[in-house]
Interface confidence: low
Amino acid sequence: AIVFIKQPSSQDALQGRRALLRCEVEAPGPVHVYWLLDGAPVQDTERRFAQGSSLSFAAVDRLQDSGTFQCVARDDVTGEEARSANASFNIKWIEAGPVVLKHPASEAEIQPQTQVTLRCHIDGHPRPTYQWFRDGTPLSDGQSNHTVSSKERNLTLRPAGPEHSGLYSCCAHSAFGQACSSQNFTLSIADESFARVVLAPQDVVVARYEEAMFHCQFSAQPPPSLQWLFEDETPITNRSRPPHLRRATVFANGSLLLTQVRPRNAGIYRCIGQGQRGPPIILEATLHLAEIEDMPLFEPRVFTAGSEERVTCLPPKGLPEPSVWWEHAGVRLPTHGRVYQKGHELVLANIAESDAGVYTCHAANLAGQRRQDVNITVATVPSWLKKPQDSQLEEGKPGYLDCLTQATPKPTVVWYRNQMLISEDSRFEVFKNGTLRINSVEVYDGTWYRCMSSTPAGSIEAQARVQVLEKLKFTPPPQPQQCMEFDKEATVPCSATGREKPTIKWERADGSSLPEWVTDNAGTLHFARVTRDDAGNYTCIASNGPQGQIRAHVQLTVAVFITFKVEPERTTVYQGHTALLQCEAQGDPKPLIQWKGKDRILDPTKLGPRMHIFQNGSLVIHDVAPEDSGRYTCIAGNSCNIKHTEAPLYVVDKPVPEESEGPGSPPPYKMIQT
């Protein structure tokens, strides 16, 4: 039966943030896992998609993600289906809205001494806490003449008088975050001497070196004063401009013009209106400098024909928010069709080979325009230009097998030898065009070879059999110099291979025939009993019909193998005395003697004054020291034979004689007396 290892559970989520509904299933057979929302299947989108068996939300949406989610597992083989527990999101959100007049029904009906109720259209979950502002100053609940009802999000002024005039805004905050009114309400209750807002300045975004205009108008009787301040409270007038606002002009109607705007001009501008009576009205607006960053590079994309693919263009950071559009071949893409733009995405449905090319994502705002190209390749299945052919390759020479294909993008070619992938090494090389080179063909290269040419769209393969044309050769070649032991039996082998089995025979280099005690048996020269006369030059001849003959020359030497007449003995010597290690060998040719002491050959030319090797082979060491202790090896060798024998040398301190010991007492061990 299908078992849920993990089931989705109801959880809190934040609007626009990530979330995950977990679902893990265990079943005896394969299962399909899908999701329902209020009983209807959930289709994957970039925002909400299946991730394994779980459902992942890149950005929770309070409208699209409200309802009951359920994970369903179905075994298509048996028809068995399992459904998880229901799960839903408690989505926390906050959304800005305007301040609107709730009572009276219209602004025209507002009169002094009437009740005025404003509503803050900021909504959210959980219900946010509201704060009201007049001209940017917070209104605390319980102040004279106004009440705040957080439940209804209302501000009630009763009765409303000229002192309540101003720009009303609200902000709200909750566990999710904070939002302020998107549009504020200007309440104007006539006290002719109070300054009233006629035109409030708006935030502006301008490009560098462009001009910015803030409009600001107040009305009152008598006319009010109007003053502009920049961030640092510096007044701006046509007579006295701060150094960084040299290009500012204040017009008679209150508008402020800034020309050739620079970064230092960005900031908050305050327009202050003061009537004969009443509080000053302070209106704020911010000047932002337009900016646009660079766009990230696109990786080239390879798509397959018939598929649907999307390429997302991440707009660069910028102010104002850059607009994004896609172009291909200089033409802006439509918002519907087969190749179209959807949001910031380039969508290619049912891709055709002709869709390949460069597509450009453009982003622009007041600060300028950025663009980034993406190269789209439509992969095709490779087609054959030249398949590998069954081939006869000559041993020892380079061999080539073709695998020539064409496709977009350039296909990748791999070769297999006996179903095993060939990795390039000193013997095998795959050229850019797919051809395989076997650098020096060997007999065991005769087998099946298969090449596979692939692109993301698919692959093709073909195989060919290689037959190796074996060269006529000795296997192995006979050693050119060989020794035979005098008066003993000896054999000299000679074997060869070729395309046809070769015939092998021996003859003496001078052409004379082999004596009767020497036989040539299928290439093996056999000496029943070696004599001095058997020494000399011999030739092994291997031949076959198609390849002719080859010859190998062997010089046979007859030797008496080395034996030791005298071997060195285990020797103990007092420190400071002389050690003699005797060694004498015999053989024909006469052997030479070398000594090895403490794992290094003792070179007679570099022995120094303390050591000497005699003509007969013996080694003498004068004035021995403890470091001379160790194993000494006598090596006897001639052109035919080498033999060695070894013995240890011990160097000991000379004992101090005790009084009880007489002068004739023997030493405690066998010594060389010198």
Partner: antibody, heavy 112, light 107 residues
Amino acid sequence: EVQLVQSGGGLVHPGGSLRLSCAGSGFTFSTYLMYWVRQAPGKTLEWVSAIGSGGDTYYADSVKGRFTISRDNAKNSLYLQMNSLRAEDMAVYYCARGLGYWGQGTLVTVSS
Amino acid sequence: DIQMTQSPSSLSASVGDRVTITCRASQGISSWLAWYQQKPEKAPKSLIYAASSLQSGVPSRFSGSGSGTDFTLTISSLQPEDFATYYCQQYNSYPYTFGQGTKLEIK
């Protein structure tokens, strides 16, 4: 084409044993849940046993301890080893893959 | 074990008739119900699975409905080849059990 070919039915004495085989072809045998279902003459269908792709086994109470279901995925074969057979075990035995595919049936006769 | 009770046990009808067979489970089985058709000396043939899903290759005149404990099989317009015995089967839990069958005969 999915095919289930059954063999191994026949006459057996009460208390005797019989082994039924079912050879599957035309599908990836190792990934499917397999059943044995039987039908006594003139009676309804009776589910006998099931074996999962992982080798997990299930039996009807009436056959538990006497029948053994097994599978050899390498041979694409399903088996039912029936021991201690009784007269009430006499039926046509069907092997089935899921709901949709059934073998041709094989008759098991238990009689003295 | 879950008992499956089919009704009626036999039914006579004519070609072109609309026929309904019901099946009741002794306990809730969600939609884990299949319907089979069996003709003499033949293996059963699956018609409906998951209570209402038509097996591929089965004519659309066959339909199934119900969930929980009560289910129906409907043949909208009887054809000569539809005269057979029909069984319901629950596969909600082991041991899987069948109804006793409904024999549909020509009137």
